[in-house]
């Protein structure tokens, strides 16, 4: 019954948050 991330309705927003965090991390490392 435990879902994969892609099946979860939260996945879309979670991926967006993850991408934004990655971008912030990149900028911080520059």
């Amino acid at each position: 019954c435990i879902h994969h991330l892609d099946e979860s309705p939260h996945s879309q927003a979670l991926k967006k948050v993850f991408a934004e965090n990655k971008e912030i991390q990149k900028l911080a490392e520059q």
């Epitope: 019954c1 309705p9 879309q12 927003a13």
Partner: antibody, heavy 117, light 112 residues
Framework: QIQLVQSGPELKKPGETVKISCKAS????????MNWVKQAPGKGLKWMGW????????TYTEEFKGRFAFSLATSASTAYLQINNLRNEDTATYFC??????????WGQGTSVTVSS | DVVMTQTPLSLPVSLGDQASISCRSS???????????LHWFLQKPGQSPKLLIY???NRFSGVPDRFSGSGSGTDFTLKISRVEAEDLGVYFC?????????FGAGTKLELK
Amino acid sequence: QIQLVQSGPELKKPGETVKISCKASGYTFTNYGMNWVKQAPGKGLKWMGWINTDTGKPTYTEEFKGRFAFSLATSASTAYLQINNLRNEDTATYFCGRVTADSMDYWGQGTSVTVSS
Amino acid sequence: DVVMTQTPLSLPVSLGDQASISCRSSQSLVHSNGNIYLHWFLQKPGQSPKLLIYKVSNRFSGVPDRFSGSGSGTDFTLKISRVEAEDLGVYFCSQSTHVPLTFGAGTKLELK
């Protein structure tokens, strides 16, 4: 402010088709998934599935595979629920709801669908 | 599917009382990412459900602090410290850790 505004009540005959709209405003439509929930008269809430507003990919629960279809008009920030070949047991109020990383935070006001011959 | 069992189904209160609603899940709601996706909604007659508490204990924007959520694993509680007239309605717990998302049957908070 964030709002989900659904289309008005529908009275249909068995075998007909209905298409419900859910217009989003106050946020970036393609950043959040959209849930659809059914509530039969005097009953609880039943999750029908969701649509990814970025990719357009719908996900349906077992009960709602076949006659039900989620779709989008992304340019109009609108999600749709279509029910084909309506049955009496489809009589219910249908809600759309925005899905964040944490929860289902904002819901539409609901659209009442009555199926009667 | 995860079954959400709410108790009681009806809760008669007087204004100013404390109210407590229980929600038990048929399996753990701890997601592999560590989050617990257990939420509480209030639905008033003729309206859509409104989010009160998300992820067990987080109050949603604009929700008064008389509402609090607690719990872990499979056992969760919503407490209203002092019931006001605007709090009357049907409370639903919901889980979104597992697909399909599921809801409790609802608890009707009503006046004695």
